[in-house]
Interface confidence: low
């Protein structure tokens, strides 16, 4: 029976490196002469780089290397024919047999990855990310799909802001250069990256990285039409309300990032809820077309928001929006009013008072404190009624006389705000005077409805 023995040895091993042991079995007494075996290598295939790459210890069967030059990339396997002879190896009297020793040369990382070109080229549109810019290719003579072959790429220069990254394609071992942060053409029109390739494991001792382990990648940035932008955005201006139509408020212009494209920007109005404004399409000048009113329902917290569009004439055309916030300073353009507009009191004044409050759509200091008064005419008003200011916002209306017949009376109240100059208004308070129970509640509602109007008489 012909035996096959398998062993391994790393490439580049020094002479004297143990490889494997072969042993033969002899049924004779091992202590007798005819049982004492001796081993020798009969042949080695292939015979490169030397026909005697290995030796065998003739007594133990240990195979070791005796020559340098094991190189997996040249010879991946050696086949040795081993002869065992008894009678201590005496060729005349001894009996012999042969076996095969198959020695596989295993890979070590003795070959660095080398770029297939000194310079690679790629291009990227500005502002785009996650796209492949260039494909880097390397060669590596080590065993494919092992850590000694797998390439790891890094950018060693030319990318101070970290805009690029390189991933390895696990199948092809190529380096895929991708953009990970957007690039602005107006800032960087080209990048020249220095890239290096290494393996996943360090190179074997004594092996150096050659110049071919580095390369350059020349990336051209392509100019793309970008949105014009308003700055500042929002733009805040303070302006008194009540401005006449035709007043120039401000200029709200946009910048176009595309410095290398000859473009014009045109302005249009996107949103102007009260239709108070117009914008010059060429120079962005904003002019009023109506009176600005802080008290308008379109003004929230004193701020009026209008939105404008800046459009360029690039291909394709791009646009950006900007918000103008007009902080409207109050003027005293609203006269105060009295609330409620209707009230009830009893025929006899005790203990009834009508609490009234002021409503002014303006704000401090054009609102309260308010002054409350009764007119001099008709004389019955001041004769029958009295008004007492409780504080800046509240007053009380009371009957001055001890009795007033049930009915509905219109009491004019003069109310004046604290604006400079102040604004006054005469508010009519409809007072239902009625007969009341001991709790001060009206008992004759039906009769009041039919009663005629009086003016405090």
């Amino acid at each position: 029976l012909h035996q096959v023995w398998n062993g391994t040895v790393p490439e580049g091993s020094k002479p004297g490196t143990y490889v494997m042991t072969v042993t033969a079995i002899d049924a004779d007494d091992p202590n007798a002469l005819n049982g004492m075996l001796r081993y020798r290598i009969v042949s080695q295939a292939p015979s490169t780089p030397s026909p005697n790459m290995f030796t065998i210890n003739n007594e133990t069967g240990d195979i070791i290397t005796v020559a340098a030059g094991l190189d997996r990339e040249k010879v991946q396997q050696y086949t040795l024919i081993i002869q065992a002879t008894d009678m201590e190896g005496n060729p005349t009297y001894g009996l012999s047999n042969t076996a095969t020793a198959v020695i596989t040369v295993t890979d070590v990382n003795d070959n660095p990855p080398e770029f297939t070109a000194m310079t690679f080229y790629g291009e990227v549109p500005e502002n785009r990310v996650d796209i492949i810019v260039a494909n880097l290719t390397v060669t590596d003579k080590d065993q494919p799909h092992t850590p000694a072959w797998n390439a790891v790429y890094r950018i060693s220069g030319g990318d101070p802001t970290g805009r690029f990254a390189i991933q390895t394609d696990p199948n092809s071992n190529d380096g895929l250069v991708t953009v990970v942060k957007p690039i602005d053409f107006e800032t960087n029109r080209m990048f020249v990256l220095t890239v290096a390739a290494e393996n996943q494991v360090p190179l074997a001792k004594g092996i150096q990285h050659p110049p071919q382990s580095t390369a350059t990648v020349s990336v051209t940035v392509i100019d793309v039409n970008e949105n014009p932008y308003f700055a500042p955005n929002p733009k805040i201006i303070r302006q008194e309300e009540g401005l006449h139509a035709g007043t120039m408020l401000t200029t709200f212009t946009a910048q176009d990032p595309d410095r290398y494209m000859q473009q014009n920007i045109r302005y249009t109005k996107l949103s102007d809820p009260a239709n108070w404004l117009k914008i010059d399409p060429v120079n962005g000048q904003i002019t009023t077309i109506a009176v600005l009113d802080r008290e308008s329902p379109n003004v929230k917290n004193n701020i009026y928001n209008a939105t404008f569009l800046a459009s360029d004439n690039g291909i394709p055309p791009m646009s950006g929006t900007g918000t103008l916030q007009i902080y409207l300073l109050d003027i005293n353009d609203n006269a105060p009013q009295v609330l409620p507009q209707e009230a009830e009191t009893c025929e006899t004044p005790d203990p009834n008072s009508i609490n009234i409050t002021a409503l002014d759509y303006d704000i401090d200091p054009n609102a309260g404190p308010f002054a409350f008064d009764l007119p001099l005419s008709p004389v019955t008003i001041k004769r029958n009624w009295t008004i007492t200011r409780l504080n800046g916002d509240f007053a009380q209306l009371n009957l001055k006389i001890k009795f007033l017949e049930a009915g509905i009376y219109e009491v004019p109240i003069i109310i004046t705000d604290s604006g400079n100059p102040p604004k006054s208004n005469i508010s009519i308070l409809r007072v239902k005077v009625c007969q009341c129970d001991s709790n001060g509640d009206c008992t004759d509602v039906d009769r009041i409805v039919g009663a005629g109007l009086g003016t405090g008489a």
Partner: antibody, heavy 119, light 107 residues
């Protein structure tokens, strides 16, 4: 930046008057109401009144309208609050504060002035 | 004048817990005019929440404000050590008043 800097601590006897100042900087003085608020030791906040430098309008808390006087010197962006006929329960930290653009909140405050009324 | 009543007067909680402070108005107050301030010992009050629910500049988003018709709340989702202070509500709708304050203290 917006700042309201108040005058230093005062010690007064009952019946006396005290005049506190609040100097504004970092904003247009005539565009904002300046409020005065006080805080007695361990107590809450109590509004005294406001002064509007734009028109000279003044509004007082009814409780203080007979004893508090608010004035201003627009040339030095300063508002004053004088409190007369001092009582021991007027011992408090007095703050000035700026009313914000809308909603009536106080967005910037002075550091406060301690007034101690003691015989 | 509108009276603002804050409850509880004192809230004893541990860091990491949720705090809910209440402010009840004696009559209706527009949400635009109800505000909250934080005050720490020896310092002026600082605007914390304005117009019921808007956080002032630099206030962390663990704070929030809300309202019913006359009830207003300030909520702190997870108390941090720096949140222990007195909080005041304030209205400027009719005249001008402050609540009595709620002291949030470490349990």
């Amino acid at each position: 930046q917006v700042q309201l800097v108040q005058s230093g601590a005062e010690v007064k006897k009952p019946g006396a008057s005290v005049k506190l100042s609040c100097k504004a900087s970092g904003f247009t003085f005539t565009d904002y109401l300046i409020q005065w608020v006080r805080q007695a030791p361990g107590q809450g906040l109590e509004w005294i009144g406001w002064f509007y430098p734009g028109s000279g309008s003044i509004k007082y808390n009814e409780k203080f309208k007979d004893r508090a006087t608010l004035t201003a010197d627009k040339s030095i962006n300063t508002v004053y609050m004088e409190l007369s006929r001092l009582r021991s329960d007027d011992t408090a930290v007095y703050f000035c504060a700026r009313r914000g653009d809308w909603g009536g909140f106080f967005d910037y405050w002075g550091q406060g002035t301690l007034v101690t009324v003691s015989s | 004048d509108i009276v603002l009543t804050q409850s509880p007067a004192t809230l004893s909680l541990s860091p990491g817990e949720r705090a809910t402070l209440s402010c009840t108005a004696s009559s209706s107050v527009s949400s635009s005019y109800l505000h909250w301030y934080q005050q720490k010992p020896g310092s002026a009050p600082r605007l914390w929440i304005f117009s019921t629910s808007n956080l002032a500049s630099g206030i962390p988003d663990r704070f929030s404000g809300g309202s019913g018709s006359t009830d207003y709340t300030l909520t702190i989702s997870r108390l941090e050590p720096e949140d222990f202070a007195v909080y005041y509500c304030h209205q400027y709708h009719r005249s001008l008043t402050f609540g009595g304050g709620t002291k949030v203290e470490i349990k």
